[in-house]
Interface confidence: low
Amino acid sequence: FPTSLSDCQTPTGWNCSGYDDRENDLFLCDTNTCKFDGECLRIGDTVTCVCQFKCNNDYVPVCGSNGESYQNECYLRQAACKQQSEILVVSEGSCATDAGSGSGDGVHEGSGETSQKETSTCDICQFGAECDEDAEDVWCVCNIDCSQTNFNPLCASDGKSYDNACQIKEASCQKQEKIEVMSLGRCQDNTTTTTKSEDGHYARTDYAENANKLEESAREHHIPCPEHYNGFCMHGKCEHSINMQEPSCRCDAGYTGQHCEKKDYSVLYVVPGPVRFQYV
C-alpha cells in the first residue's frame, strides 16, 4: 500500500487507481494531496497530480537550490512539482556557474555537483561563456546566437540599448561582466551595442564615453537609502531623494508596487534563444 502519492509516480503525474480511498483518505483531492503546487485531478477512482503550470515568458532568471537556472520562479516551481522535491530560490539571476538547463526535468541533469578539476584559465569563463582550451589566444568563447530573437528594445545596466534580452546576455558574456535588463525600451542616452566577430570569439571593444550618463544623471538626484532600509524594496533599488521624507523604490524590470513586491505581468520579455535555458 503506498504511503504517499510519490509511490504512484508516472512520467505524466501520479496515478493511484486501484487503491481504496475509503480505507486511506490520502487519495482524496484535498489541499494536502498534491505536494509542490500540483493540481489534483480525480477521475473516477483515479487521483492524479498534474504539474501544468501556466508560466509566462518573463525573463527573470533565478538560481535553484539544485544548482540549476530557471527562466523565472514559476518554472522553478514547476520543476519542483514534476520532481516532487523542494527547490528553493538560492539567488536572483542565473546560477553563477550554470550547471543545468532550467527545465529541471532530469534527475541528474544540472545537479550542480562541483567537481574538483585542475585550475586553468578556463576557470575564469563566466556569464555563459564556454571554454575553448584549443584556442591560441582567447579562451572564453561566447556561442550565443541572437539571430532568431525578436526585436524588443531594452535598456541595460551598462547604460546601453540592446535590441533584445539575448543581446544583453551576449554582451554580458562578451565583456565577462554582469549586465542586466534595467528597463523596457531604449536608454534615453542611446549608445550602440557590440558585434561578434566571424569566428564567434570576442575581443573587448571600446564604447562611447557617455555610456553611463543615464546612471550618473539618476544618481545626481538620488542618494542610496540608509542601511536600516535594507529590504525596503523587494525587487529593486532603494533611493532617497533630498526632497522626499520617505524613500522610494526603483523597481527591477518585471516588478511594480511601492516596494517592488508585485510581478508586473504587463512586461513581456523576449527570452534569449538557444543559450542556457530550456522551457517545458
Epitope: 537550490s65 539544485n66 544548482g67 528553493l88 538560492v90
Partner: antibody, heavy 120, light 107 residues
Framework: DVQLQESGPGLVKPSETLSLTCAVT?????????WSWIRQFPGKKLEWMGF???????KYNPSLKNRISITRDTSENQFFLKLSSVTAADTATYYC?????????????WGQGTLVTVSS | DIQMTQSQSSMSTSVGDRVTITCKAS??????VAWYRQKPGKSPKLLIY???NRHTGVPSRFSGSGSGTDFTLTISSMQPEDFADYFC?????????FGGGTKLEIK
Amino acid sequence: DVQLQESGPGLVKPSETLSLTCAVTGYSITSGYYWSWIRQFPGKKLEWMGFISYDGSNKYNPSLKNRISITRDTSENQFFLKLSSVTAADTATYYCARGLRRGDYSMDYWGQGTLVTVSS
Amino acid sequence: DIQMTQSQSSMSTSVGDRVTITCKASQNVVTAVAWYRQKPGKSPKLLIYSASNRHTGVPSRFSGSGSGTDFTLTISSMQPEDFADYFCQQYSSYPFTFGGGTKLEIK
C-alpha cells in the same frame, strides 16, 4: 536601526504550551524579509524552528510541524511563537531573527534571546 | 535533512594567527551557506552569506569560500574579539540547518 526583542515566560511546565513574542522596531514586518524563530540548546546546538514571511506565509521545521505555530500582529509589529506539548527537551534559549530577502535566508538581525526552561 | 558538519569542535589559536574553519554539507547546497560568530552570552551575528559575501560592517579579515559541499571561513589575522563560537548554516533546503559549531580558544 532594526531591533528584535523576545519576551515570554522563562519557565513552562511539561505538556503545556510555550508562548513567546518578538517585538520588532525599526522595520515593518510586512515590508519584507522572513521572520524566524531559532533555538539554541544547552550544548550550543542551533535549530531553526520556522519563519513567517512578510506576506504572512509560514514555513516550519518538519521535526516540530505538529507542535509549532508562528503568527503575527502587524498593527503591533510583532510575531509570535507557540510550541505545544513541551517536554524537558524543549529547554533552550529562544531567538527571533530576521532572514534576508527571497533567495537568501541567512539571518542578519537577531534578538538577544530568552532562556526557557521546561520543568515541573 | 541536510547535515552540516564542522569537524573541529574547538581550535586553539593566538592573536595575529590565520585561522580556517571548515564546514561540510551532507549534500550539494550550491552557495547557500552563511557563517555566524557568537560571543559568550550573546546572540549569533551574521558574518558571511551566500558562502563568500561579507555582511555589512563585517571586518575584511573575515572571508568565506566554497560551493557544493565544502565551505571554509577564514580569519586572516585573529583579534581578541574573535575568540568565540562559529557556526555555519545552510539555506539551500528546508529545514535550514546549522553546523555544530567551532570554538576558537586562546592558545
